[in-house]
């Protein structure tokens, strides 16, 4: 039975050039999270595994590092890194949880800095 | 080339044991959750046990939970899985397997050691 | 515990056919779903996880598609060396159950 929740930053904005934090967060369950994906579009951009801990996709080495806690931190940003999300939690005994970002890179100052997640 | 070679199975009676081993090369072997699924002779596929990569955490079915366990040696790339009280339906075909990286599916499988239980 | 339904169980085709094989889960399980092809007395084999991702090395006549319980394999043209088992494996939920399969076979 699946009881958790995954709750994340929803929909963001940054601007073009910065960095942002994608974080997700998995409540209301006492599953145990045996690893973490972080894809983009269905491109697997990092793992993050209970034993091993981190591991970057090497095609997105340059511009993404691991965290904070769980999350993953975009550096760099492209108007081509407007987009789809996805943090999947990998639990037992629940099973797989996927949580939704919506990333928009902005051209200008347009981007909110208000952003809980934002890095300045 | 990933290569997965189980041995260790054999004919043993109710209530005994059998440890299978899995030899594992061609990959990083330590970085990879691995299973163990069976097959009843003529039937389908069933999930057994998972470990996690380095061996921290394990995962079973219902039917295996407190007879089975699943352990492996990074050190000699290789996984086991130690059978007590055997049943006449754990009666099967034994693979090995390997996750994705991903750990989406389970990409390489060894070729299998049969277990018969029976008296 | 998700149960997996194939159907059909077996299915009779040529070389040259196409051929669909579908996939029913008991609940949703999003897009956890994977495609495994087993011959007679061999391991099985992966081809298609995430319900439309395809291996490595799979040949492009294989295809899945489907998200929450429909889920399909598509063989666009049956070739000889295509006639075995096939099995879904859902990944949504332990424990992860396979389907009883879908034997094809030579018509």
């Known amino acids: 039975m699946m009881t958790g929740t995954i709750e994340t930053t929803g929909n963001i904005s940054a601007e073009k050039g910065g960095s942002i934090i994608l974080q997700c967060h998995l409540s209301s369950t006492t599953a145990q999270v045996t690893q973490v994906n972080w894809e983009q579009q269905d491109q697997l951009l990092a793992i993050c595994n209970a034993d091993l801990g981190w591991h970057i996709s090497p095609s997105f080495k340059d511009r993404v590092a691991p965290g904070p806690g769980l999350g993953l931190t975009l550096q760099s940003l492209t108007v081509n890194d407007t987009g789809e999300y996805f943090c999947i939690y990998h639990t037992y005994p629940d099973g797989t949880y996927t949580g939704r970002i919506f990333l928009e890179v902005l051209e200008s100052s347009v981007a909110e800095h208000g952003a809980r997640f934002q890095i300045p | 080339e990933v290569q997965l070679v189980e041995s260790g199975g054999g004919l043993v009676q109710p209530g005994g044991s059998l440890r299978l081993s899995c030899a594992a090369s061609?990959?990083?072997?330590?970085?990879?959750?691995m299973s163990w699924v069976r097959q009843a002779p003529g039937k389908g596929l069933e999930w057994v046990s998972t470990?996690?990569?380095?061996?921290?955490?394990?995962y079973y079915a219902d039917s295996v939970k407190g007879r089975f366990t699943i352990s492996r040696d990074n050190s000699k790339n290789t996984l086991y899985l130690q059978m007590n009280s055997l049943r006449a339906e754990d009666t099967a075909v034994y693979y090995c397997?390997?996750?994705?990286?991903?750990?989406?599916?389970?990409?390489?499988w060894g070729q299998g050691t049969l277990v018969t239980v029976s008296s | 515990d998700i149960q997996m339904t194939q159907s059909p169980s077996s299915l009779s085709a040529s070389v040259g056919d196409r051929v669909t094989i579908t996939c029913r889960a008991s609940?949703?399980?999003?897009?956890?779903l994977t495609w495994y092809q087993q011959k007679p007395g061999k391991a099985p084999k992966l081809l298609i996880y995430?319900?439309?991702k395809s291996h490595t090395g799979v040949p492009s006549r294989f295809s899945g598609s489907g998200s929450g319980t429909d889920f399909t394999l598509t063989i666009s043209s049956l070739q000889p060396e295509d006639f075995a088992t096939y099995y879904c494996?859902?990944?949504?939920?332990?424990?992860?159950?396979f389907g009883q399969g879908t034997k094809l076979e030579i018509k």
């Open positions: 397997a390997k996750w994705l990286l991903s750990y989406y599916a389970m990409d390489y």
């Open positions: 609940q949703n399980i999003n897009v956890w």
């Open positions: 494996q859902q990944g949504q939920s332990y424990p992860y159950t």
């Open positions: 470990i996690s990569g380095g061996g921290t955490n394990t």
């Open positions: 061609g990959f990083t072997f330590s970085s990879y959750i």
């Open positions: 995430k319900a439309s």
